[in-house]
Structures are given as C-alpha cells and as structure tokens.
C-alpha cells in the first residue's frame, strides 16, 4: 500500500501552503524506501536516494514556481510514481448570509471570505436552539443538527424547508480543502430575516370621471403562502413623470385611490410588502407601473360609497402571543372630506 | 507588499453623495475580502463594511446600512464606498482594509477624510 | 451585535515599563480578538491576531493572551515607537467590532 495519504481532492495530487515548507511523497514505493527526484521533463537531480529523506521531497519555502508535476525513481530506476503539486491556502471561515421570503422557509448562501486556490467543498447543517425557561437567557443543548440540504447545481445555496417562526436556529458552514476544514457558525430566526417578496400584479388604472385620482392594485407575491397565517402589509409609493420626490402611503389592503395625481400627468407607482406585525424588512419595491388620470367629466351620480381604501376588520393585537392577523377581504368605506371636495372643484 | 489607496473623500452637504475608491496593489486582490473602517474625530475606530471576493456578499453597520453600498471591481483591483444621504455623523477619515486568512483587517490603507458640513 | 470594553481609557507610562491592557466581549468570541496600535495620521497596525499570535515583523515585547470574553494585551518593556493608541477587535460575528481604544503616552 502507498506511504502516501490521500488528501480529499484529484488522485495523484498533493498540496502545500505558500511560503511553507512542502513535503511531496512518491506514492509508489514502501515508506522509508530512498528515491531521487526529478522535475517531469527536466533531467536535473532535485534530491537524490542518499539524502536520507527516504521516500519524500521536501521543498523549503515554496512558491508558485515550485507548482507542477514531479517523478520519483527508486534505486534501480524504476518509476515510484508522478505527483503533482498545487499550492493554495488552508480554508479561512466562510461568510454566511440567511434570508427568508416566507414564514415557513430559510435559505443560507455562503462564499469564501479568501479564495485558497484549492479544491473545495462546503458542509452545511442546522440546529435549533431552545430556550430553557422563560426568564432564563442561557440555551440548552440544541436539537440536531439536521443537514441542510444544499442546492444541486453547486450554487452556494442550502434551504431549510418547515422552519418554526418562533425558533432560533443555528447555521454551521464548514470549508473544507486538502489543507483543513474551517466553520462559520450563524445564529438566526425567521422573524429577523424575513424579508418578503415584492407584490405582484400591480396595476394603474384612472378613475373616469376623477382628473386627479388613480386606483393601484395588487396581489401578494406568489411565494407568500397560499393560506397564510401571517398577513402582509404594504407601503405604496408614486410620482408625477419627471418628478423627483415619491409620495409615500402605506394602504389598508390590496388597493390603494390616489387622490393628489397631477391631472394629465403619467405617474410612476410601485408597492413593498412586509410582515403585518413588523418581523424582519420591507421588500424590495415592485417593478413601477404607469397609469395617467382621467381626463373625462365627472359621472352623473356621485356614489355614497367607494371601495377607495382597505382596512382591516380586526385590528391586531400586539400583546396577545401569537396575534390573530387580519382579514384579506376589503372593507368598504365612506368618501373623506378630501373627496367631496375634489369633486366640487371638478364640477365647477 | 500589500498597498492600499483610498480617494475620493472631501467635502459634502448633509444629504449629499460621495464615492470613495481603494486601489489595491501587491496581493491578488481578487481572492480577498475587503472592507471599509472608519474613525470620526475624537472617536475609536468603527468597522463599516466587508464584502466577499465575488462580491457576492454584502455586510454592513446598522448605522449605515440602506444608505452606504460597498461593491467592487476585480479587474481593476478596485475597492469602493458608495455613500449617499450623507450625515453630519459620517465625517470621518475612511480606511480601505484587507482580510487575510479570516483575520479581519490585517492590512490598512492611509485613510481619506471625508467632511459632511453645510 | 457585539460590545467590546477596554481598561483602562488611558495611561501614563515610561520608556522601560511594563504595559498591561485589558479588553472584555460582551459574549464569547472564542479567540477570534485582534490588537491594533493606531497613532494619529497613520493607518491602524495590527500587532495580535487570534487573541495571542504575533503578527509577522512585530517585536517579541508584544503579547496577548486570553479566550472567551476576557483578553489581555501586554507591552513587556515599553518603547519610545510604542505611544499611541492600543485598539481590541472582535471578528467572532460577521459585524466585527472595536473597542473605545487605550491611550498610552508618555509619563
């Protein structure tokens, strides 16, 4: 059997630090056994059979002039073997980031903080962390760990799917190349990286009859769970073509009636989603959408009612545990003072 | 030997922009992390960003966070600090700074300062 | 995120001095402290890294020791080039953090 332990990485490689002494095996021969070395192509002696090395090379400081391929020969001049040397460093931690676009899943992305110039792999697992008592800040042993399954295509992505919302998992990435292994250990919990999906679906449309209104809608992103338990609420942003400032609303439900659009004026308008009860971020904003309002005279009859704005129909309980979220359905509600007016000054 | 430039600071109104730029030279910038640190006057120093020698990741001080973007350019070994609504409590003199082998900030440039006064 | 706490703010020391400061985390970091000497118009030097290795080219007179959440940082005999002021650093979390730094000048 070879005196030569494989490292993980290509058969027929072995690998040293730069500016570190190396030592090279030749894989082909019983350990202690004298060999000469020599550079594959080159006919100089590196090291001969009497330089009680036995079996191996040693290269004091080496740099990348010293990368390449190597032959070892026994006394009577048979081939001990061929290896290739590659230089690189040991891992160094890796930078873990964790992101959730739901309440039910987490995925983690990882990169290297210093590229070694080596073969390498990553292990990734979870647990989760438990509390012991209410009043106590100290942990106890974890459950786990679990791996966390990582994406196939050798994206630097693992997810863990029927996370709990209420638990603090614990997230171990371990670098591992021919010359060591090296852990980034990331505690996180949902709700403090839940960050939603932008809305989708959203649209501009005028108010006929309304120079100075425009109705956007939306629906919640598609990766929202389908009954969610956790509602979402939205912050809205437009502005008049050409102008620099965005005017902010946060709406009551899917649908918002701007009643300050500049008449005749295409306006910009997009949507951000987060957590009804303020866990984690805002979205991203959604991709803008465009709408110009009407330009057409006010219909005959004003009507009483409008569903101009969405509120909620319970409001949420921020003391109670796990807070019951409100209802998706709008609600409909009386024109504001703000309404008649504009629609005085468009019928004058 | 490692070297590292920072430019670009100067004098700004609060609210106003600014981007700051670390050329890098004697290392093989492109497999390090780097990152921005920086002291106001009178202070302690004060880590402000890193990002991953794809550029891939991203990391910053709550006190900036949404405000700053640190990005940067391999083929150009080129670091940079974008920093936009700039306030009275960002002046400061700004560090370019290498990671090596997981140690963070083992190298520095000499600093450049940035002032934000009306 | 995490708070480092050094003692003491500063000290008043002469050339020969012995020089001890020390340096607390708010949690453990393990080993993962770094110490820096910074003097006005330079950039900061690292002198200790992983709480007790000495970085390459810094004299033997520097040392660090400690694990956990307590560190200490020792000057055996002090140097005129060794007034400035002395920096801990924790990089255990991806948000590393400095603590309020130690003035040492000259007595």
């Known amino acids: 059997s070879s005196p030569c332990p494989q490292a993980w990485g290509p058969p027929g490689v072995q690998y040293g630090q730069p500016g570190r002494s190396v030592k090279l095996c030749c894989p082909g021969v019983t350990a202690g056994d004298p060999v000469s070395w020599f550079r594959d192509g080159e006919p100089k002696l590196l090291q001969g059979p009497d330089s009680g090395l036995g079996h191996e090379l040693v290269l004091a400081q080496a740099d990348s002039t010293d990368e390449g391929t190597y032959i070892c020969q026994t006394l009577d001049g048979a081939l001990g073997g061929t290896v290739t040397l590659q230089l690189g460093y040991p891992p160094a931690r890796p930078v873990v980031s964790c992101q959730a676009a739901d309440y039910e899943n987490f995925s983690c992305t990882w990169s290297p903080s210093q590229i070694s110039g080596l073969p390498t792999r990553y292990l990734t697992s979870y647990r989760k962390k438990t509390v012991l008592g209410a009043d106590s800040q100290r942990r106890s042993p974890s459950t786990g760990p679990w791996p966390c399954p990582q994406d196939p295509l050798g994206a630097a992505r693992c997810v863990v799917h029927g996370a709990e919302f209420w638990s603090q998992y614990r997230i171990n990435v371990t670098e591992v190349n021919p010359l060591g292994a090296s852990t980034r250990l990331l505690d996180v919990s949902l709700q403090s990286i839940l960050r939603p999906d932008p809305p989708q679906g959203l649209r501009v449309e005028s108010v006929p009859g309304y120079p100075r209104r425009l109705r956007a809608s939306w629906t919640y992103p598609a990766s929202w769970p389908c009954q969610p338990h956790f509602l979402l609420k939205f912050r809205l942003q437009y502005r008049p073509a050409q102008h620099p400032a965005w005017s902010t609303v946060e709406p009551a439900g899917l649908e918002e009636v701007i009643t300050d659009a500049v008449a005749g004026l295409p306006h910009a308008v997009r949507v951000s989603a987060r957590d009804f009860l303020d866990a984690g971020t805002w979205s991203t904003w959604s991709p803008e959408a465009w709408g110009t309002p009407s330009t057409g005279t006010i219909p005959k009859e004003i009507p009483a009612w409008g569903q101009l704005h969405t509120q909620p129909e319970v409001e949420p309980q921020v003391d109670s545990p796990a807070p019951p979220r409100p209802s998706l359905q709008p609600h409909p509600r009386l024109l504001d003072h703000r309404d008649s007016v504009e629609q005085v000054a468009v019928l004058a | 030997e490692v070297q590292l430039l920072e430019s670009g600071g100067g004098l700004v109104q609060p609210g106003g922009s600014l981007r700051l730029s670390c050329a890098a030279s004697?290392?093989?910038?492109?497999?390090?992390?780097m990152g921005w640190v920086r002291q106001a006057p009178g202070k302690g120093l004060e880590w402000v960003s890193s990002?991953?020698?794809?550029?891939?990741?991203?990391i910053y001080a709550d006190s900036v966070k949404g405000r700053f973007t640190i990005s940067r350019d391999n083929s150009k070994n080129t670091l940079y600090l974008q920093m936009n609504s700039l306030r009275a409590e960002d002046t400061a003199v700004y560090y370019c700074?290498?990671?090596?082998?997981?140690?963070?900030?083992?190298?520095w440039g000499q600093g450049t300062l940035v002032t934000v006064s009306s | 995120d995490i708070q480092m706490t050094q003692s003491p703010s500063s000290l008043s020391a002469s050339v020969g001095d012995r020089v001890t400061i020390t340096c607390q985390a708010s949690?453990?970091?393990?080993?993962?402290l770094n110490w820096y000497l910074h003097k006005p118009g330079k950039a900061p030097k690292l002198l200790i890294y992983?709480?007790?290795n000495l970085q390459t080219g810094v004299p033997s007179r520097f040392s660090g020791s400690g694990s956990g959440t307590d560190f200490t940082f020792t000057i055996t005999s002090l140097q005129p080039e060794d007034f400035g002021t002395y920096y801990c650093?924790?990089?255990?979390?991806?948000?590393?953090?400095f603590g309020p730094g130690t003035t040492v000048d000259i007595k």
């Open positions: 700074a290498r990671d090596h082998m997981g140690i963070v900030a083992t190298d």
């Open positions: 004697g290392f093989t910038f492109s497999r390090y992390m």
């Open positions: 990002i991953v020698p794809s550029g891939g990741i991203t």
């Open positions: 949690q453990d970091i393990t080993n993962y």
């Open positions: 992983d709480a007790s």
């Open positions: 650093q924790q990089y255990d979390t991806l948000h590393p953090s």
